[in-house]
Interface confidence: low
């Protein structure tokens, strides 16, 4: 299928280089091995090239000793729990020379009443209990310690916080006689931060709170609270930042209205309205003040909460997010669709683009997909020639030694990257489109044609002629 982009890399990759020692930059405190990019100024690209070359030359001697795994630590404070009362926890891989800490919040939808929480417990227990968690996890994407896979922050201390509270990381209510389930997502984050202070976080320069999907929304809900906690505990110099991936949802009208019976058919506003009551969900204080009592649900929506946040946040969002389409009752199967649906989908992309207009640090490819930052090939997608790791590097530079984003963007180092083309997959670096029901890869050109896009429109970004495309479609190739 020619119009297809997969998450596999092209060709053979050179062996990934290990982490390695380097001399500190002038005027920086000497840090122990391994190299920490917080100590680097000036020409990052040439510096990276030198490091890579050095690292590759050392690779054969040390590759065997590399351990990519993050190790499970259940919280010592066992009163901070998953839904079923089992202790929450986190996976950690330390990088002792580094003063960067990446805390990643896992995603995985939510449940908002007794019935769908019971059902979730039966079918997705790992998302409600720590009882069967593996002892280790491999860091992928932005959690990888391999520069090949993670050119952005490969050397950071990596923390993966499993999602087991089903509350979009917002709850603060324990399990009790009255509550069958605990909803303590927000408290889990706070407790993990407290424990990590004793494991080296106290010496951090930057803490990046990242997350995907529900975890991305969790970042928006908790990033300021983490910064406040660190200030209260006496660590005001740790710069707290957020990276919200695929958690910037719209409270839009569904394509087809449906009753709020289960999680995925419930309109975004209905689900969150119900959830926030069921979870005793907390939202950022400054946002809460903007909405009257009972209207706090508004703060779960990125474009409403973002302007109230103090910490810098980088927003990553597919313009045609599959989770957004799912809650909007759009189910794409590659079958021909009516014009109304095509216009609905295009309008969704337009609306999303509009909400990112005033978000200086954003990366929004015109693709139909969901989540990106812990995919191994998160480096593959580009917007206007810039990859996500590159954009994050530029964002770091723009924030250097400052809590506030600099107003003037760095020349040749963009941080506001939002696709302007108006249909799904018009960006040639988009990942594979999959049938939502079967998981099968779909021919992009065929899929777009089914959606009613004209030949020229579909052919151009595939590097094809309309007549060539016709031939491919008639052949199903």
């Amino acid at each position: 299928s020619e119009g297809r982009k997969t998450w596999r890399r092209r060709g053979q990759q050179p062996p990934p280089p290990p982490r390695t020692e380097a001399a500190p930059a002038a005027g920086q405190p000497v840090e122990s091995f391994p190299l920490d990019f917080t100590a680097v100024e000036g020409n990052m690209d040439s510096f990276m090239a030198q490091v890579k070359s050095l690292a590759q030359s050392l690779y054969p001697c040390s590759a065997q000793q590399l351990n990519e795994d993050l190790r499970l630590h259940l919280l010592l404070n066992t009163s901070v729990t998953c839904n079923d009362g089992s202790p929450a926890g986190y996976y950690l891989k330390e990088s002792r020379g580094s003063r960067r800490w990446l805390l990643f919040l896992e995603g995985g939808w939510y449940c908002f009443n007794r019935e769908n929480c019971d059902s979730r417990y039966d079918t997705m227990r790992r998302l409600m209990s720590s009882r069967d968690w593996p002892r280790t996890r491999t860091g992928t994407g932005i959690l990888s310690s391999q520069p090949e896979e993670n050119p952005y922050w490969w050397n950071a201390n990596m923390v993966f916080i499993p999602y087991c509270s089903s509350d979009v990381w917002s709850g603060a209510s324990p399990k009790s006689d009255k509550n069958e389930y605990a909803f303590m997502g927000s408290l889990i984050i706070q407790e993990v931060v407290r424990e990590l202070l004793g494991k080296g976080l106290s010496g951090a320069k930057v803490l990046l709170l990242a997350g995907s999907s529900a975890g991305g929304t969790g970042v928006l809900l908790n990033v300021d609270r983490v910064a406040e906690l660190l200030e209260e505990l006496g660590y005001p110099s740790i710069q707290v930042r957020g990276l919200a991936d695929s958690g910037w949802f719209l409270d839009n009208k569904q394509y087809r209205r449906s009753d709020c019976i289960d999680t995925i058919n419930c309109a975004p506003t209905d689900a969150i309205r119900r959830g926030i009551r069921y979870w005793s969900g907390m939202v950022p204080e400054r946002c809460q003040r903007q909405f009257k009592e009972g209207e706090e649900w508004n703060c779960f929506f990125g474009y409403k909460v973002y302007p109230t946040l103090r910490c810098p946040v980088f927003v990553v969002q597919w313009l045609f997010d599959e989770a957004q389409l799912t809650v909007d009752n759009v189910h794409l199967t590659g079958q021909p669709v009516q014009e109304g649906l095509r216009l609905y989908i295009q309008n969704l992309g337009r609306e999303l683009r509009h909400t990112l207009k005033d978000v200086p640090a954003s990366f929004a490819p015109a693709c139909l997909s969901h989540e990106i930052i812990i995919r191994s090939h998160w480096t593959d997608v580009q917007v206007k020639g810039t990859s996500l790791p590159r954009a994050l590097h530029c964002w770091d530079r723009s924030l250097h030694d400052s809590h506030k984003a600099s107003k003037t963007p760095l020349k040749g180092c963009p941080v506001h990257l939002v696709d302007s083309c108006p249909w799904p997959h018009c960006n040639p670096s988009c990942p594979t489109v999959r049938d939502q029901f079967t998981g099968q890869e779909m021919n992009v050109a065929q899929f777009l044609m089914h959606m009613g896009f004209d030949m020229q429109t579909v052919a151009q970004p595939q590097g094809l002629e309309p007549s060539e495309l016709l031939g491919m479609l008639s052949n199903g190739s």
Epitope: S1, E2, G3, R4, K5, T6, R10, G11, Q382, V383, K384, G385, D419, S420, C421, C426, N427, P428, S429, C430, Q460, P461, Q462, G463, L464, E465, S467, E468, L470, G471, M472, S474, N475, G476, S477
Partner: antibody
């Protein structure tokens, strides 16, 4: 290892025929559109022909239209170029190349096979 | 057909210096924020090798000293710092429509 290997080149008289083959390995051949290019001695690269992944679409350069036929056998991972009514100006190194899924660039090239048309 | 005009035809650059090669298309080869221009390196007796795709993206395994830029009709390949092994002929290629065409090539010599 991703590889394309051409064969079938040689010396042929004007008006003669020749069939070039390109054997693909190390990737899912049936996923990719394939092209033939050529390069005359001391000259630049010239596109010759294209075939889509499922063989339904074929395109030819004006200079070879009606004389050359591109085909593929996805079961055997083979691309072919049947050349007839050969002329001296067809003398060149012939390369097969894989077109990447998106964007229309050629990320894998064969090593080439030489075709000489001379009396 | 889109005609690609490459300049200069040949270029001699000292080791460690910068080499700049230009490619101008007779028609715009960009659309929707993406530029369908690619760069290849070819050494004598070898096939072309993809260096840069979609104007500015470095192909996997290609050294970072190669970079591409440009949009619309004007594109540039930069090599800095030039190394001995970079002596070769460089071609630009567009894929905005069929047929794909190549520039006439720029021969880079290392002084």
């Amino acid at each position: 290892e991703v590889q394309l290997v051409e064969s079938g080149g040689g010396l042929v008289k004007p008006g003669g025929s020749l069939k070039l083959s390109c054997a693909a390995s190390g990737f899912t051949f049936s996923d990719y559109g394939m092209h033939w290019f050529r390069q005359a001695p001391e000259k630049g690269l010239e596109w010759v022909a294209y075939i889509s992944s499922g063989s339904r679409t074929v395109y030819y350069a004006d200079t070879v239209k009606g004389r050359f036929t591109i085909s593929r056998d996805n079961a055997k991972n083979t691309l072919s170029l049947q050349m007839t009514s050969l002329r001296s100006e067809d003398t060149a190194m012939y390369y097969c190349a894989r077109k990447h899924y998106n964007g229309g660039y050629f990320d894998v090239w064969g090593t080439g096979t030489t075709v000489t048309v001379s009396s | 057909d889109i005609v690609l005009t490459q300049s200069p035809a040949s270029l001699a650059v000292s080791l460690g210096q910068r080499a700049t090669i230009s490619c101008r298309a007779s028609k715009i080869v960009s659309t929707s924020g993406y530029s369908y221009m690619h760069w290849y390196q070819q050494k004598p007796g070898q096939p072309p090798k993809l260096l840069i795709y979609l104007a500015s993206n470095l192909e996997s395994g290609v050294p970072a000293r190669f970079s591409g830029s440009g949009s619309g009709t004007d594109f540039t390949l930069n090599i800095h710092p030039v190394e001995e092994e970079d002596a070769a002929t460089y071609y630009c290629q567009h894929s905005r429509e069929l047929p794909p065409t190549f520039g006439s090539g720029t021969k880079l010599e290392i002084k």
